[in-house]
């Protein structure tokens, strides 16, 4: 944020007799006074361009990686497992989000110059990506739990059910992201670059807290608990039964979940601290405000980085993904068929045998 000088003729004239004693930093200040808080954000000019470079790299990696993942899954029609369908949706979510990164990058440098429509759409895609991501991972954990702990294929056999679950996830993600679509807009302030943020009039702070606590609970904490429960029991079953093959088959899924947590947990913890501070549970100070703002910026980069990491996990840990990719390359004559591994099967990351479906 650039330096600005708000020197006024007198404070009585500046406030026009308004009682602003209850206004708190940025979240409650009306748009025309957004730049008036005396706790100034620290200018981090260097970080601005570092962030743009990160965004550009993530954009390219995500575009390439997720496109390949979708291609491989769509090609392997025959042995496609339930988990593959979830991973296909996961790749789609990441791909859609990646498409918005150039806009976010530009806004880091010039402020929000794209107007309210793009502010709503791009913010919506970002939120939907996050929520659909964790909900899909929760569904994968339930699927693995049912397949390994209860040795059931009820979900795997009913393809329409899986499609319904995926559609429901997208619907629920849209619902959780709805506040962003309704309330985000371009906010113009004197001497400060325009910003894309929630504006709900005089009750902005209260609404923002409610609209942050609800999605954080249902969109992050609940799926997280589901995942911990399912994988806890799945791991216990695998260790007790000494199922080496299935244990290996879980590596990709565990890696996907672990990376998701490493990328999104820090951001959500900082967001929680920010929420506690804004709701006066912990005292707000200028120092804390600045530290939290910087932490939000840093941890948000981690979250954004997540959209390009899943394809890398599949490439380095998922044997079947590599095989599937090689198969596509061989079909199109880009590599010789002799270089294909002997056990190269069409499935992307899974095969079904007996009553369980193993994912690798």
């Amino acid at each position: 944020m650039e330096d600005f000088n708000m020197e006024s003729d007198s404070f009585e004239d500046f406030w026009k007799g308004e009682d602003l004693s209850n206004y708190s930093y940025s979240s409650t200040l009306p748009p025309f006074l957004l730049d008036a808080a005396p706790c100034e954000p620290e200018s981090l000019e260097i970080n601005k361009y570092f962030v743009v470079i990160i965004y550009a790299l993530v954009f390219l990696l995500s575009l390439l990686g997720n496109s390949l993942v979708m291609l491989v899954i769509l090609y392997s029609r025959v042995g496609r497992s339930v988990t593959d369908v979830y991973l296909l949706n996961l790749a789609l979510a990441d791909l859609l989000f990646a498409l918005t990164l150039p806009i976010w990058a530009a806004s880091k440098v010039n402020g929000w110059i794209f107007g309210t429509f793009l502010c709503k759409v791009v913010s919506l895609l970002k939120e939907v990506n996050f929520y659909s991501g964790i909900l899909l991972l929760a569904c994968i954990s339930v699927d693995r739990y049912l397949a390994i702990v209860h040795a059931t294929r009820t979900l795997t056999q009913k393809r329409y059910l899986v499609k319904f679950i995926c559609l429901s996830i997208w619907g629920l993600s849209l619902l959780l992201a709805l506040p962003v679509l309704l309330f985000r807009r371009t906010v113009y302030s004197s001497n400060v670059s325009p910003a894309c943020y929630e504006d709900m009039g005089n009750n902005t702070a209260n609404w923002r807290m409610l609209l942050r606590i609800l999605p954080q609970s249902f969109g992050f904490i609940v799926p997280l608990l589901i995942m911990l429960f399912c994988y806890g029991f799945t791991l216990r079953t695998l260790f007790k039964a000494h199922m080496g093959q299935k244990h290996r088959a879980m590596r990709v899924i565990f890696a996907v979940v672990l990376i998701f947590l490493l990328c999104w947990l820090p951001y959500n913890l900082v967001l929680l601290a920010d929420t506690l501070m804004r709701t006066q549970v912990i005292q707000e100070t200028c120092e804390r405000r600045n530290h939290i703002d910087r932490a939000l910026d840093a941890t948000e980069i981690l979250g954004i980085l997540h959209s390009c990491l899943n394809p890398l996990i599949y490439a380095f840990i998922g044997q079947k993904f590599r095989h599937g990719l090689l198969k596509i390359l061989a079909i199109h004559g880009l590599i010789s068929k002799d270089s294909l591994p002997k056990d190269s099967r069409p499935s992307f990351v899974g095969s079904s045998s007996g009553h369980t479906s193993t994912t690798l």
Partner: nanobody, 125 residues
């Protein structure tokens, strides 16, 4: 927590100038909104001027606007009050105050957590 020590007060002729300094000890001075208040004998403590954390925004009371200038040097942990064209009615004890929140401009003494001992400024006619 921050400790504040004012200096630079004294006796000055009407129309003269003075520069008050407020040295802060303690951490994170650059995160405090700083202000000057004054209290004349038998009167309430009144707001004089305030400055934002990085010094790019300032606020003044009507009575000192155009004559007084508040500034800060975060590297030296010091805030200054440059007083020009002094009048007899500027005679008071001048206090330095610090607000760790900075959520909004505060023009009453209740908005500031930390205070100095004060420095006497006397303007003779």
């Amino acid at each position: 927590k921050v400790q504040l020590v004012e200096s630079g007060g004294g006796l000055v002729q009407a129309g003269g100038s003075l520069r008050l300094s407020c040295a802060a000890s303690g951490r994170a001075f650059n995160y405090y909104v700083m202000a000057w208040f004054r209290q004349a004998q038998g009167k309430e403590r009144e707001f004089v001027a305030a400055i934002s954390t990085r010094g790019s925004m300032t606020k003044y009371s009507d009575s000192v606007q155009g004559r007084f200038t508040i500034s800060r040097d975060n590297a030296k942990n010091t805030v200054y009050l440059h007083m020009n064209s002094l009048k007899p009615e500027d005679t008071a004890v001048y206090y330095c105050a610090a607000d760790p929140r900075g959520s909004s401009w505060s023009f009453s003494s209740g908005g500031y957590d930390y205070w100095g001992q004060g420095t006497q400024v006397t303007v003779s006619s």
